[in-house]
């Protein structure tokens, strides 16, 4: 292991606790340790240990309590299925390794619903859905045995119920006990038993919950009825003054530690950013909590439906704010969240039983004071009137998530505080704080969104292309002339925009080469769409050698492009995805996403530039305000501008300028950053303004960039607001919905 | 306010160039996102756009018509032009100039009151 | 006073770009209704426009005799921006 065995900060000696064919970690400042194994494997007999009083670890005891000398990284199986009702399934065999298939078929007379064929995955769970043979005779459904997991009670009558148990060990995830309800869907969701080392895949998490979050966001008309037996999909009317509340609580106590607690403030913003980008606009109310609980924004409070002011407020909180008090109170947590659900004077207020009410819980797991959390949910649910009314129980006004971080989450406890609710997963166990990390990420990026303009993968994982989804490289062969290189960026599934003076009109489609994404291959080239009013030699004969206004062009591509995690579009002005992007409201003119995204003062904003291979994104300043015509008079010094008597020859109402030292120290394009895009970032999206066109300073004369660049080196883009009758009409059947 | 005048020949032989002239106030045709068009309406017929001059100059025409126009501007005089070569009797029309605001959800907000023209030979 | 309602199809989707014009029969041009919906300024509030896809209507709620003009619906969508036929109205 890599740790030296000089003892821990706790008392327990670190002599003879190593794991065969495995490492450890020390946990808790030394007063716990987790077991780590290679993927595929786990460790035996338990995952942690903790360093008791006596100054010695827990022993290392199995399921049925026998105790083990030395612990040791086993081969992860999957369970066998205990009992398959009216069918057969094959092979059979007392366990199953990774990569084992088993396929279900059912008698005649019987229907398989779920998975016919399921795959042994490398956590220890089975691929796919339970496999379930039913032949429609009861009221609700067959619910089924999930494999690993004991069904009593075989009668689907309405009010009939089945309990779930889980063999010594294991713990029971979901429902134990679930009743036939009216209408034909079963109370509660789908149970599974859980070894503790089993955790859930960020994909596994991203899905499950982004599907059931989905759920409760969107909703569906209540009127689509359903007949006995159907899968019902929860039924929400979204009764237009009815609104939701979303309450993020996360654990700040000591166990977490700094690095994890910022982790997941990384997800919850995320989180909110995914709820914007739906279109519906919840409260928030923000918790965190170590011994006692601390409230950020409360729910009642004006900006806590302003997405950005929730996220400035929670960027805002320090780890440290719990450092003196760092126990676990988690009821105390929930206890905060009661009190901004409740109202003054127990008075209900008008609507009271229409906002819909999503607590989200982040913690390493153990509440170590406080008493039992799940006594909260309860007087929660009581003040909702959740559960009373059997013919109108109220369950969609009510979500509980709960996120497990770590090895030390008591399955237990996390799973008693979750919602239950059909078809939906509302308790998920990661890892750890960089699984939950890819949860939120995958979460944001699953293929709804994908089509979303300026959306990017910043994660710690991705790649350049992750973090500059549209950006294209474009090279031109010239024989016997070398080859020109330009950027690009992807603007619609068929087409890329750059600057015009990458080609010359003697060009042909087969020598352009363009590749997105990061990608080896090229695309094929349809047509390149100059704009009709640029004109290289324009203004030869008034002594200006090279005219670069409305220097734009769009590469039309042969092939649709396939959107992904490293190929997406950015956002281009004046267009309905930009309109959401900013969150603005969908009146919002032409006009006014110009003074939101290129006010008259000076703008931050980006290109983006290869250096040694590697896309790196370079910041700089657009000159919008009272600098912008020292910023534009420095065109001058450009080479062949020097004999322009009026500057406004050169730099015309197209042209937007960066560069220069004020505020800031611009850094500068290069010639093979020409026609890339500079690209505003707000609302953590990226919206192109300009395309980058001409400088007056070759700052990379022998391929690298100088250091000491004078105040005059100043770069000129062309102003996308500018070209927008053009972009609009060469880009009309990309469905962009130019406004 | 804004106001569009347009004014033209009034009559052409068949094969001559029309030239009209469209004088606006009331706005200025370098403020972003105004346009101005020109479009055509034939005695008891429906209407029809011909072509659209923007702010930044770029120019827009109806490619479904046999023969294309060209449009131009004079920004600092406030007017804008349409040329048509070699006309014919088909041409015969109310010719009017409108001022577009950029933008999918705008219509044509102001309309200049017409100017005829016949082509006869 | 009477309610009357004028339709124009589309040949495909237009996304709501539709406008809807008024000339009186001395020729004068005048904007009603911008983006299917949204009354011109000036615009009587008895003028009122609907519809999505292909298929959209003016209704003129509380007809007065200096309705009396021929409509033209243009499309906004796509070049070249193209006008309907036009609907005369007149009253008994």
């Known amino acids: 292991t890599p740790w030296s065995l000089a003892r821990p900060q706790g008392s327990c000696s670190l002599e003879g606790v190593e794991i065969k064919g495995g490492s450890f970690r020390l946990l808790q400042e030394g007063q716990a340790l987790e077991y780590v194994c290679p993927s595929g494997f786990y460790p035996y007999p338990v995952q942690t240990r903790t360093c008791r009083s006596t100054g010695s670890w827990s022993t290392l005891k199995t399921q049925d309590q026998k105790t083990v000398r030395k612990a040791e990284c086993r081969a992860i199986h999957c369970p066998r299925p205990h009992d398959f009702e009216n069918g057969e399934y094959w092979p059979r065999s007392p366990y199953y390794n990774v990569s084992d298939e088993i396929s279900f078929h059912c008698y005649d007379g019987y229907t398989l619903r779920g998975s016919a064929n399921r795959t042994c995955q490398v956590n220890g769970r089975w691929s796919g859905q339970t496999a379930i043979c039913d032949n429609g005779a009861g009221y609700c459904s067959n619910p089924g045995i999930p494999i690993g997991t004991r069904k009593v009670g075989s009668q689907y009558r309405l009010e009939d119920s089945v309990t779930y148990h889980c063999s010594r060990g294991l713990t029971l995830r979901g429902s134990q006990r679930r009743t036939c309800q009216e209408g034909g869907s079963w109370s509660g969701t789908e149970p599974s038993c859980q070894d503790s080392f089993m955790y859930d895949t960020p994909q596994e998490v991203a899905e499950a919950f982004l599907s059931s979050l989905t759920e409760t966001i969107e909703g569906v008309d209540a009127e689509d009825g359903h007949g006995p037996g159907e899968q019902q999909k929860r039924k929400i009317v979204l009764d237009p003054s009815g609104s939701m509340n979303i309450y993020l609580v996360l654990d700040g106590s000591d166990s977490i530690g700094a690095s994890n607690f910022t982790g997941a403030k990384k997800c919850l913003v995320n989180l909110i950013e995914k709820v914007a980008s739906y279109g519906v606009k919840p409260r928030y109310g923000l918790v965190t909590y170590a011994t006692y609980p601390k409230i950020w924004v409360k729910v009642s409070e004006a900006d806590s439906s302003n997405a950005d002011w929730v996220t400035k407020q929670l960027n805002e909180i320090n780890y440290e704010d719990h450092k003196l008090k760092s126990g676990t109170n988690t009821k105390k947590a929930l206890q905060a969240v009661y009190s901004m659900m409740s109202w003054p004077d127990d008075v209900p207020p008008e609507g009271w039983n229409r906002t819909r009410h999503v607590i989200i819980l982040m913690t390493d797991g153990l509440h170590n004071m406080g008493g039992d959390p799940i006594t909260v949910i309860d007087e929660i649910r009581d003040l909702l009137y959740i559960g009373k009314d059997r013919k109108n129980p109220r369950e969609d006004y009510l979500d509980v998530y709960v996120f497990g971080v770590g090895p030390l989450v008591n399955q237990v406890n996390i799973n008693a505080l979750a919602s239950k609710k059909d078809n939906e997963q509302h308790v998920f166990k990661v890892k750890d704080m960089e699984n939950l990390e890819d949860v939120f990420y995958q979460m944001i990026d699953e293929s709804q969104s994908l089509s979303l303009c300026g959306m990017v993968w910043e994660h710690r994982k991705g790649t350049d292309y992750h973090k500059q989804p549209w950006q294209a490289k474009i090279s031109v062969i010239r024989p016997s002339k070398g080859h020109e290189s330009c950027m690009g960026a992807v603007v619609s599934e068929y087409f890329v925009l750059t600057a015009a003076h990458c080609f010359t009109v003697d060009d042909k489609e087969h020598s352009i080469k363009v590749s997105v994404g990061g990608e080896k291959r090229d695309l094929e080239i349809e047509v390149v769409l100059f704009h009709p009013n640029y004109n290289i030699n324009g203004k030869k004969e008034a002594g200006i050698p090279e005219f670069y206004d409305y220097d734009v062009a769009l590469i039309k591509l042969k092939n649709k492009l396939k959107y992904g995690q490293t190929i997406r579009p950015i956002c281009l002005p004046c267009t309905e995805g930009t309109t959401r992007a900013l969150r603005l409201p969908p009146t919002t003119t032409c006009q006014q996403q110009k003074e939101e995204l290129l006010p008259a003062q000076d703008i931050k904003a980006l290109f983006v530039s290869e250096e040694e291979k590697k896309l790196t994104r370079k910041e700089v300043y657009i000159k919008n305000g009272d600098k912008k015509g020292s910023c534009e008079r420095d065109a001058q010094y450009a080479p062949g501008y020097d004999k322009v008597k009026d500057i406004s020859e050169v730099v015309t109402p197209r042209f937007l300028c960066t560069g220069g030292v004020s505020p800031y120290a611009d850094p500068n394009t290069c010639r093979g950053d020409s026609g890339g895009p500079l690209i505003v970032h707000k609302r953590s999206r990226f919206i192109q303004v300009g395309v980058i066109s001409w400088g007056v300073v070759d700052v990379c004369k022998n391929q690298k960039r100088q250091k000491q660049v004078p105040a005059h080196a100043r770069d000129f883009h062309i102003n996308l607001f500018q070209v927008l009758p053009w972009l609009k009409e060469k880009l009309q059947d990309e469905d962009l919905g130019f406004l | 306010q804004v106001t569009l005048k347009e004014s033209g020949p009034g009559i052409l032989q068949p094969s001559q160039t029309l030239s009209l002239t469209c004088s606006f106030s009331?706005?200025?045709?370098?403020?972003?996102?105004?346009?101005v068009g020109w479009i055509r309406q034939p005695s008891g017929k429906g209407l029809e756009w011909l072509a659209s001059?923007?702010?930044?100059?770029?120019?827009y025409y109806n490619s479904d018509l046999k023969r294309r126009p060209t449009i131009s501007r004079d920004t600092s005089n406030s007017q804008v032009f349409l040329k048509i070569s070699s006309v014919d009797t088909a041409d015969t029309a109310t010719y009017f100039c409108v001022q577009i605001p950029y933008g999918s959800r705008n219509g044509f907000d102001y309309w200049g009151q017409g100017t005829s023209l016949t082509v006869s030979s | 006073g009477d309610r009357v309602t004028i339709s124009c199809s589309a040949s495909q989707g237009i996304n709501n770009y539709l406008n809807w014009y008024q000339q009186k029969p001395d020729g004068t041009v005048k904007l009603l209704i911008y983006y299917t919906s949204s009354l011109h300024s000036g615009v009587p509030s008895r003028f009122s426009g609907s519809g999505s896809g292909t298929d959209y209507s003016l209704t003129i709620s509380n007809l007065e005799p200096e309705d009396v003009a021929t409509y033209y619906c243009q499309q906004h969508s796509k070049l070249p921006w193209t006008f309907g036929g036009g609907t005369k109205l007149e009253i008994k």
């Open positions: 001059i923007w702010w930044n100059d770029d120019k």
């Open positions: 009331g706005f200025s045709l370098s403020t972003f996102g105004l346009g």
